[in-house]
Interface confidence: medium
């Protein structure tokens, strides 16, 4: 090509038009272009409709192009990655109609001051959203409702003073949240929900340590190993966790997680944390929380880091959490991490009703009610949008699982209420090794047999049981890949998808969730 550099790598035809002083799309680009770099040009305005002839285009880099306006006409139905970082956009274009397959959107370092409620409507495939370095002060409560597959969210370096309580609702795949360098003074109660967030960046905010901060303090205590400090130019895998980086602004940089909360209201004599723990729909009996539903949590994603294996957790409904595929060359604005393939532990659990003290870390996860896909904003020219009609009896969830091309994953399905234990495949045979002893009712750390070869020692110092719980050795038979999740009725059977030898399991292996 006379203007741009064209190269073919594997199945991609990459066209590099960076730094060409272009004011418009060059003519006669190869029609089978899959990756188009238009960075560091002087486009000022750009119409996505000009790219409609490029029906294989999956990546578009428009960063550093002095863009003040992006026209979202036409449809690019296969575009997966759009980089609009380092431009002059003052409002986020409504991309849902034009880019229905978008999975990565980078609008970092623009001039966004607010986001309308429907800003992300129609972007149901979005997995990574980067809004770092804008001028956002507030966010609409339902901003992320249309993006249930979101895995990475960066809101760092904005002017946010508060966050909507339900911002992260339904984001079961979220593994990275960057909120550093804002003007946040508190975190609303229940903000983080109950799923583990492996990578959280929260430093550089003026946290106000008073009684309102106690929910956040408790979350920091429970997730200390997942709180990191962002360092520009340092790979996220080389960062070390530092919960002390989250500091009280009104108390000489005292770490929030150590804030004593003296004088704050308490419930009885159990300590001041109870009032600020978030246990949705719990059924309290005096100072106990009764588990009325069995939901088993187990690790589903390993994170390769120098500090060991980290696992994000999903409920027994086997929600899909596929790791995102990342481009080999990361740009500095993209705070991304690479994760190896999912795995499911190889064990069978037989659960019975258990009473917990209220002290242990809550992992309650309200079962989300399925929703149909979000409506799409005003139609682009020449296209008409129709929404699926929800069935009154079995509504289809918006969030669907993310199977890799080689390993189909089970589709997400709510875990049914446990009735009688009923194995999904074959019942577990009698263990050849002696059956593990029930978990005692005193505060100890029981050892749990898994696959008879690997040991898990959960931190269960707060556990008090009314009935014994036994973990049986799992079946040696590998469960085949499933298109549909197994029906879980008190029994969970998993298997290791890769051939790795018994990776170390996270010690916070959790058992039941109170309602």
């Amino acid at each position: 090509h006379p203007i741009c550099e064209v190269s073919k790598v594997a199945s991609h035809l990459e066209v590099n038009c960076d730094k060409r002083n272009l004011t418009a799309l060059p003519p006669d680009l190869p029609k089978d272009t899959t990756i188009l770099h238009l960075s560091e040009n002087l486009l000022y305005t750009f119409s996505l409709a000009t790219l409609m002839p490029y029906t294989r285009l999956t990546q578009l880099n428009l960063d550093r192009c002095e863009l003040t306006k992006l026209q979202v006409d036409g449809t690019l139905p296969v575009l997966g990655t759009l980089d609009l970082s380092h431009n002059q956009l003052q409002s986020l274009p409504l991309l849902g109609q034009t880019l229905p397959a978008l999975t990565v959107l980078d609008v970092s370092f623009n001039r966004l001051t607010s986001l309308p409620l429907g800003a992300l409507r129609g972007l149901g495939e979005l997995q990574e959203l980067y809004l770092k370095g804008n001028e956002l002060k507030t966010l609409p409560p339902g901003l992320l409702t249309p993006t249930p597959k979101l895995e990475k969210l960066s809101l760092a370096n904005n002017n946010l003073t508060e966050l909507p309580a339900g911002l992260l609702n339904g984001l079961e795949n979220l593994d990275t949240l960057l909120l550093q360098e804002n003007s946040l003074y508190t975190i609303p109660k229940g903000f983080f929900g109950s799923h583990l967030l492996p990578f959280a960046f929260l430093h550089g905010n003026p946290w106000l340590c008073n009684c309102e901060i106690l929910y956040f303090r408790r979350w920091l205590q429970d997730n200390a190993e997942n709180v990191y400090v962002w360092k520009q130019g340092v790979d996220v895998k080389a960062m070390t966790s530092n919960v002390a980086s989250v500091q009280c602004d009104n108390s000489d940089k005292f770490p929030v997680y150590k804030y004593p909360g003296k004088g704050c209201p308490t419930l009885g004599d159990e300590g001041d944390t109870d009032l600020y723990d978030y246990y949705p729909e719990e059924d309290t009996e005096g100072d106990k929380v009764r588990a009325t539903r069995t939901v088993v949590k187990f690790p589903t994603k390993a994170h390769t880091t120098p500090w060991g294996l980290f696992y994000s957790w999903s409920t027994a409904s086997l929600d899909s959490q596929m790791p995102s595929s990342l481009h080999p060359t990361q740009e500095s604005t993209k705070e991304q991490t690479t994760f190896p393939p999912r795995w499911t532990p190889n064990f069978t659990l037989h659960m019975e009703s258990i009473t917990f003290s209220k002290t242990p870390k809550s992992t309650t996860e309200p079962t989300p009610s399925p929703t149909t896909s979000e409506p799409v904003p005003e139609p682009a020219p020449n296209m008409t949008t129709l929404e699926p009609t929800p069935s009154p009896t079995t509504p289809e969830p918006t969030s669907e699982p993310a199977p890799s091309p080689t390993t189909p994953e089970p589709t997400s399905e709510p875990a049914p209420s446990p009735t009688t234990p009923e194995p999904t495949s074959e019942p577990a045979p009698s263990p050849t090794t002696p059956e593990p002893t029930p978990i005692p009712t005193i505060a100890t750390s029981p050892t749990i047999l898994v696959s008879a070869t690997s040991l898990i020692t959960p931190k269960s110092t707060f556990l008090t049981t009314t009935k014994p719980v036994s973990l049986l050795e799992s079946t040696k038979k590998t469960i085949p890949e499933l298109d549909q999740p197994p029906k879980l009725r008190g029994v969970l059977q998993g298997h290791l998808e890769s051939s790795r030898n018994d990776p170390f399991l996270h010690p916070d292996f959790c058992c039941l969730l109170p309602l």
Epitope: P77, V78, A101, T103, V104, Q127, S325, S373, P388, P403
Partner: nanobody, 117 residues
């Protein structure tokens, strides 16, 4: 690599109907799917697509006549074409959007639809 195989094309009189099907070799429930068409001497044109969540979108020229649907259990996406017109004559290509922004787009080999007047 995912293989997409179209079927159902053929010769039909104006006003008639055809149903195109596209079968994928692997599970595709996560991906948006759709149909393009290309008439001789013309650019490839987007006809319809359906997202993984079930939202559908149609070109103005086919709205009210064409219906796209997907069956995730069978890994198929279909295009029901009613009230066909001669200008619908083209090679129809099924496509599968990328799983992530760094994946390729997968295309079928195309199936010929000819509408005679």
């Amino acid at each position: 690599e995912v293989q997409l195989v179209e079927s159902g094309g053929g010769l039909v009189q104006a006003g008639g109907s055809l149903r195109l099907s596209c079968a994928a070799s692997e599970t595709f429930s996560i991906r948006a799917m759709g149909w393009y068409r290309q008439a001789p001497g013309k650019q490839r044109e987007l006809v319809a697509y359906i997202t993984s969540g079930g939202s559908t979108n149609y070109a103005d020229s086919v709205k009210g006549r064409f219906t796209i649907s997907r069956d995730n259990d069978r890994n198929t996406v279909s295009l029901q074409m009613n009230s066909l017109k001669p200008e619908d004559t083209a090679v129809y290509y099924c496509y599968q959007a990328p799983r992530s922004g760094y994946d390729p787009v997968y295309w079928g080999q195309g199936t010929q639809v000819t509408v005679s007047s």
